[in-house]
């Protein structure tokens, strides 16, 4: 499988929320013995491969919101901890994956990262990202609401583990 | 914060086995990789073996494949590591350990580790 | 199995000096590769993954860097707390693999 980044650029005003999100493509293993872990962070285009740092959204790491479940289940965050951050982060039946982010300020701006891992109880994993930015901008020159740029490109890693 | 909390230092006859216990508290059990380290006095770190919980199923070092067995119980967030047979030179220092993600990514998490000495 | 090997074994600085510790692979291993700081008595703590990411509360006096099979990690300015022994670890194969540790002693 692989992760698409639907749009690799978010404008967002300050204040505004905004749903960043990534889409599971190609056929994915709905077995008993796979699972899928997806979770999102911040991160910076490294020198040798976009999203290899994993850093916090707003306090929370890529662990507090990971969301864990078989094949193209529909999952959400623990609602308490990413709520209190104005952070959501969901799955759908349909390989759709986001994170909403309210009440936008310019400390939102940056490189985000989805990461989807796939997980066998044979000791194999197939892991993938994608990244997007986020600019949040205040003043005379943002725009009313969000405007999104779609991907012209996808940036994804596959790592598989022997 | 996660926190993986072991069980005491034991003492064991050669021959005999030990369990090793892990108590996860703190984070998503089930999800995550925990690894079984250990560490001979004055030696460098030696990685025994794996487990996901939600899969059951282990991995081990071809050094203590048949030897080692790692089990966990996700009813109670904890990990398991016995060792059978066993002779003077596995007395050690042994940690388990969480992975980030997955299977083999970093180890971001450990317990504080239990001395096992083996003496008769 | 994927050998690590380090270098060198131990040496002897001052606090201030620029430390350099070198792991060598014995096959690709691509950028999977963390760097874990041990002082005598404790569990060893993760300083560095993906070869070059610092984690989480990590001084960025430690820095990481390579891919392949020859990997560094350098710490800037030696402080007081740095003594201990570090170890370089494969994340791209079973079975996890270990270097042999480099012990930073007080010159």
């Known amino acids: 499988f692989k992760v698409a980044t639907p749009y690799s650029l978010y404008v967002c005003p300050e204040g505004q929320n905004v749903t960043l999100t990534c889409r599971l493509l190609g056929p994915v293993d709905k077995g008993h013995d796979v699972t899928f872990y997806k979770t999102w962070y911040r991160s910076s285009r490294g020198e040798v491969q976009t999203c290899s740092e994993r850093r916090p959204i707003r306090n929370l790491t890529f662990q507090d919101l990971h969301l864990h479940h078989g094949g193209h289940q529909a999952a959400n965050t623990s609602h308490d901890l990413a709520q209190r951050h104005g952070l959501e982060s969901a799955s759908d039946h349909h390989g759709n994956f986001s994170i909403t982010m309210r009440n936008l300020t310019l400390l939102d701006s940056g490189l985000y990262c989805c990461l989807v891992v796939e997980i066998r109880h044979h000791h194999s994993e197939h892991r993938v990202h994608g990244a997007m930015e986020l600019q949040v901008q205040t003043g005379k020159d943002a725009p009313s609401n969000c405007v999104v740029y779609p991907s012209s490109s996808q940036d994804s890693e596959n790592i598989t583990a022997a | 914060q996660v926190q993986l909390v072991q069980s005491g230092a034991e003492v064991k006859k050669p021959g005999s086995s030990v369990k090793v216990s892990c108590k996860a508290s703190?984070?998503?059990?089930?999800?995550?990789?925990i690894s079984w380290v250990r560490q001979a006095p004055g030696q460098g770190l030696e990685w025994m073996g794996g487990?996901?919980?939600?899969?059951?199923?282990?991995n081990y070092a071809q050094k203590f494949q048949g030897r080692v067995t790692i089990t966990a119980d996700e009813s109670t967030s904890t990990a398991y590591m016995e060792l059978s047979s066993l002779r003077s030179e596995d007395t050690a220092v042994y940690y388990c350990?969480?992975?980030?993600?997955?299977?083999?990514?970093?180890?971001?998490?450990w317990g504080q580790g239990t001395l096992v000495t083996v003496s008769s | 199995d994927i050998q690590m090997t380090q270098s060198p074994s131990s040496l002897s600085a001052s606090v201030g000096d620029r430390v350099t510790i070198t792991c060598r692979a014995s096959?690709?291993?691509?950028?999977?590769l963390n760097w874990y700081q041990q002082k005598p008595g404790k569990a060893p703590k993760l300083l560095i993954y993906?070869?070059?990411s610092l984690q989480s509360g990590v001084p960025s006096r430690f820095s990481g860097s390579g891919s392949g099979t020859d990997f560094t990690l350098t710490i800037s300015s030696l402080q007081p707390e740095d003594f201990a022994t570090y170890y370089c670890?494969?994340?791209?194969?079973?079975?996890?693999?270990f270097g042999q540790g480099t012990k930073v002693e007080i010159k």
């Open positions: 096959q690709s291993i691509a950028t999977s």
């Open positions: 487990i996901i919980p939600i899969f059951g199923t282990a």
């Open positions: 993906y070869a070059s």
């Open positions: 670890q494969q994340g791209a194969y079973y079975p996890l693999t």
């Open positions: 703190g984070g998503t059990f089930s999800s995550y990789a």
């Open positions: 350990a969480r992975h980030s993600i997955g299977w083999v990514a970093e180890l971001d998490y």
